[in-house]
């Protein structure tokens, strides 16, 4: 009921707590002398379900049979309405609709660690919508029993606060949980277990790793465990990997040797414990230990390539390039590269350590036979040196690969294809495909890229350091012993019409013809490989179509003669550039009048 009501009563039969689907009878009755003033037959009693009128009756009492109430609490309020006055509340009552508890399922108990306490969990089943109390009972040997009650509404966990000890690890204990509410009760099936069944060891702690003589091949993992632990599981992985390596060990006594770790690799290690071969459960995984394995001397050999450049009659510039070893080959932090340059006949050698770069340039005489050796060094030693004899890579014309082509292959890839050289193709030991951004000045600072291809391949997909709308000079070398032949081509992965035309910077007259000079289009405006330049001209005030001359693009060419202009006529000239995608806009316009005599 709401409270002790002065004006009347609301009673509920059979009970104010009912099973879902039940019917209730609600009676509202006025106390003596609490009706409408003067004339009691004018009493109008109204029954509300919350704010909805469900029944009314004139007189001292009202009866109502109510069905179909929802789960939860429903409030009924009885009001009195008299003529010419507001309704007044007489009394009210709540009806609680719920269900009896279902049988708790999947009761399971656990003790975390040898010093922990027994705690059990279960599944409650469907919501009762009523206050439901859970009682957990544990019985053990010698008629010992423990009991714990749960006052929480959604109770599915209780800790007994008692500790099972290993004195008699095979002794049986039985747990049972009982749910009780106003509509009934239900008990779980009993769960029977021993100490070994329910004790879940604490995860191992104080994990550390030692490398004897700073060697990855002599590695021991140490940890601490609870006293009764019999089994351990170890898992470890490189920090950048998602896959674990797993090892099961018995009676490890807090140590285990690991034999398959890679050098100079950060690993994550975790350990779990168990008390018995087939009883009980594994502990949680320990906190991770992260540790880096020691370095080992590098394996593998550097991929080395070179470029020669003629300086003058007696000197040449050699530029050496090499690629970083892979992490698995470097096996440590590369501290420096050792480059040895040797003249093979005279035996003179010079050695240099290079740090922070993967290239080296030097000037050597054009005479003599030269060789280089390059190796990588970490704190533990050096890789085997890569030896290369310096030769004229393009000297053997018969070794030059034929029909070299370069075609765009999707985003930022170029497919380079070729035919074997005319000379016995079986003489080719390997192909090297080299590419670098095309710079009109032939800038030697432009990074060089290369890849090696087996002698039976006649194509290579280049994708490293390839940018859209940039033209690359691509060379294919065929190497055979101390000889090499090469062919070159220009290629791009993506192209469009150039953003601007060449800028004419000078027009000069020479013996009745003119020489036009221009500035190259900036590389970032070329938008791919240029195929042609066009020079346009027309008489200054004429509306006629301009004439044009198309010149194949050559990197170093920046001028061209025209000899079809009439003397003493003023012409307007301009230039455009073309890629395979189309023609640029006009460059600047220049006027010119040829002074020479008419023919």
């Amino acid at each position: 009921k709401i409270d002790a009501c002065k004006r009347g009563d609301v009673t509920v039969k059979p009970s104010h707590v009912i099973l879902l689907g039940s019917t209730v009878n609600i009676t509202c009755s006025l106390k003596p002398r609490q009706g409408c003033f003067h004339y009691s037959r004018r009493n109008k009693l109204i029954l509300y379900k919350f704010d909805r009128r469900i029944n009314f009756h004139h007189g001292h009492s009202l009866n109502s049979q109510v069905t179909g109430l929802p789960l939860g609490t429903t409030l009924f309020v009885c009001k009195l309405a008299c003529i010419n006055s507001d309704e007044i509340q007489i009394c009210g009552a709540e009806i609680f609709v719920g269900v009896a508890p279902e049988q708790p399922q999947n009761l399971s108990c656990i003790q975390k660690g040898e010093q922990g306490t027994v705690a059990c969990t279960w599944e409650r089943g469907r919501d009762t919508h009523l206050y439901t109390e859970y009682t957990l009972q544990l019985s053990g040997p010698k008629n010992l029993t423990w009991q714990k009650q749960c006052k929480d509404i959604y109770c599915d966990y209780l800790d007994f606060g008692i500790n099972l000890t290993p004195e008699s690890p095979e002794s049986n204990f039985t747990a049972k949980v009982t749910a009780v509410n106003s509509l009934g009760s239900s008990s779980s099936l009993p769960s029977t277990f021993t100490f070994l069944d329910i004790v879940r060891p604490l995860p191992p702690w104080d994990i550390r790793i030692k490398f004897q003589k700073a060697s990855v091949s002599r590695c021991t993992l140490y940890w601490r465990d609870e006293g009764l632990v019999l089994l351990n599981r170890l898992r470890y992985r490189p920090s950048n990997s998602r896959l674990w390596n797993m090892v099961n060990v018995t009676k490890a006594k807090g140590r285990h040797d690991l034999l398959d770790l890679k050098p100079f690799t950060e690993y994550e290690f975790q350990i779990s414990s168990k008390l018995h071969l087939y009883k009980g459960s594994w502990s949680d995984w320990s906190e991770s230990l992260r540790a880096q394995t020691p370095e080992e001397e590098p394996t593998g050999m550097l991929d080395v390539w070179y470029m020669k450049r003629h300086i003058d009659y007696s000197r040449q510039q050699i530029s050496l390039f090499w690629k970083n070893l892979s992490v698995s080959e470097a096996r440590g932090k590369i501290l420096h590269y050792q480059v040895t340059l040797q003249e093979l006949t005279g035996g003179k050698a010079m050695t240099q350590n290079i740090t922070g770069h993967t290239s080296w340039t030097t000037v050597i005489p054009r005479t003599g036979n030269w060789a280089v050796a390059v190796s990588a060094a970490n704190s533990k030693g050096s890789s085997l040196p890569t030896r290369i004899n310096i030769m004229n890579l393009c000297e053997a014309g018969l070794l030059a690969p034929r029909q070299v082509s370069a075609n765009s292959e999707g985003m930022d890839n170029i497919l380079v294809t070729w035919q074997p050289p005319r000379k016995d193709p079986s003489a080719v030991q390997e192909y090297v495909v080299e590419w670098r951004e095309l710079h009109p000045g032939g800038d030697t600072q432009v990074p060089l890229n290369w890849l090696r291809s087996r002698p039976y391949n006649v194509s290579a997909l280049i994708s490293e350091n390839i940018k859209s709308y940039i033209c690359y000079e691509i060379r294919v070398y065929a190497l055979s012993g101390d000889q090499g032949g090469c062919s070159s081509i220009l290629g791009n992965s993506k192209h469009k019409a150039p953003l601007s035309g060449p800028h004419i910077n000078a027009i000069t007259e020479e013996k009745g013809s003119i020489l036009i000079s221009w500035n190259s289009i900036p590389v970032q405006e070329q938008m791919g490989c240029l195929l042609h330049y066009r020079i346009y001209w027309k008489e200054r005030d004429s509306n006629s179509q301009p004439q044009l001359c198309e010149i194949p693009y050559r990197v170093s060419q920046n001028s061209h003669p025209i000899n079809s202009l009439q003397p003493r006529v003023t012409y307007v000239l301009w230039m455009t550039a073309l890629t395979a995608a189309g023609e640029s806009s006009h460059g600047n316009e220049r006027e010119f009048c040829l002074q020479g005599k008419a023919n």
Epitope: V17, G72, E94, F96, Y131, K151, D152, Y154, S182
Partner: nanobody
Framework: QVQLQESGGGLVQAGGSLRLSCTAS????????MDWYRQAPGNEREWVAS???????YYDGSAKGRFTISRDNAKMTVYLQMNSLKPEDTAVYYC?????????WGQGTQVTVSS
Amino acid sequence: QVQLQESGGGLVQAGGSLRLSCTASGSIVSIYNMDWYRQAPGNEREWVASITSSGDPYYDGSAKGRFTISRDNAKMTVYLQMNSLKPEDTAVYYCKVPTEKGNYWGQGTQVTVSS
């Protein structure tokens, strides 16, 4: 055991607004309705509004359209936002949680509406 503590009452002019709060201790309140009642001097305690455990609101005719009941189960708190207050709303406002074991009431908070 559930304890209820109301707050937010005070003196306000007719037409003004107040927001009452009632905070419960004991998580069982989340499965029950939470109600607001009021008692004016010399009158009986009367029901004002209820909100079910799933958040459905109900109002007495005198409160409908002016008052709004809401609840925050995480904070175990029920609120009554009262707008367009009238002098006849002057009363002590009580928070109540009905359970099948009995009703839990707060101590009440005084609301006075002056004309």
